[in-house]
């Protein structure tokens, strides 16, 4: 089958890194600099991606593969193949149209990207707040009061108050 296909279409013999050149009786010509073909049998080469401005070259373009970009420090990739670079914020902030803004009370962000998310509502799971939340960290939920059986309690209950001047019976 491969032999038949080759006889029918000489371009199928052209490997990655070349194109099937109609100007030269369909011989395989090398992709020109700043272009590539990642598959065989192509009739043109693809123009290499340019990593400019806020984009930084992670992998150079070769005759058989496109360049790959990432973002300069202070920015992070968004989209397939790092199609966009978005500004980093500090933990405890989110990016808005007006720049980085602190998370509102009751929300947190533990990353340099993304949005502020609400603290976990411990009471929805019947649990109590063990550690309070901050702008950078979610609350830590403790065991529910029902989980604390008298014998298993790790928290010592306070001693009953005694009235002054009275001795125990």
């Amino acid at each position: 089958f491969e032999r038949t296909r080759s006889l029918q279409d000489p371009c199928s013999n052209c490997p990655a890194g070349t194109f099937c050149d109609n100007n030269r009786n369909q011989i395989c010509s090398p992709c020109p600099p700043n272009s590539f073909s990642s598959a065989g049998g192509q009739r043109t080469c693809d123009i290499c991606r340019q990593c400019k401005g806020v984009f930084r070259t992670r992998k150079e373009c070769s005759s058989t593969s496109n360049a790959e970009c990432d973002c300069t420090p202070g920015f992070h990739c968004l989209g397939a193949g790092c199609s966009m670079c978005e500004q980093d914020c500090k933990q405890g902030q989110e990016l808005t149209k007006k720049g980085c803004k602190d998370c509102c009370f009751g929300t947190f962000n533990d990353q340099k990207r993304g949005i502020c998310r609400p603290w976990t509502n411990c009471s929805l799971d019947g649990k109590s707040v063990l550690v309070n939340g901050t702008k950078e960290r979610d609350v830590v939920c403790g065991p529910s009061p029902a989980d604390l059986s008298p014998g298993a309690s790790s928290v010592t209950p306070p001693a009953p108050a005694r009235e002054p001047g009275h001795s125990p019976q």
Partner: nanobody, 122 residues
């Protein structure tokens, strides 16, 4: 009509130098992506060097880096390839090439001239 006329080739001893010229007509060289390809005896085409209009950045094949220099004279509409420290493996027909950009986003190249023969031999 677009034409590319190469000249400057010849017989040179190893270690010697040559300067190839490519006179362009029918288009403005300074507005185009252009370069040099070569074909050694019994071999396929190989890109040697290119100069890209966007910023004038240059490309050189690893085998010629540090030995060949591409340049252009916009006033004369001419492309040059200065070749020094020539080696036997540089023996080839050298063609001036012009990038051809296609509507679908692809790119190929065009060599309209007859090329100029460079032979490096003692």
């Amino acid at each position: 009509e677009v034409q590319l006329l190469e000249s400057g080739g010849g017989l040179v001893q190893p270690g010697g130098s040559l300067r190839l010229s490519c006179a362009a007509s029918g288009f403005t060289l300074s507005h185009e992506d252009v370069g040099w390809v070569r074909q050694a005896p019994g071999k396929g085409l190989e890109w040697v060097s290119a100069i890209l209009d966007s910023g004038g950045s240059t490309y050189y094949a690893e085998s010629v880096k540090g030995r060949f220099t591409i340049s252009r004279d916009n006033a004369k509409n001419t492309l040059y390839l200065q070749m020094s420290s020539l080696r036997a493996e540089d023996t080839a027909v050298y063609y001036c090439a012009r990038y051809v950009y296609h509507a679908g986003g692809g790119v190929t190249f065009d060599t309209r001239g007859q090329g100029t023969q460079v032979t490096v031999s003692s």
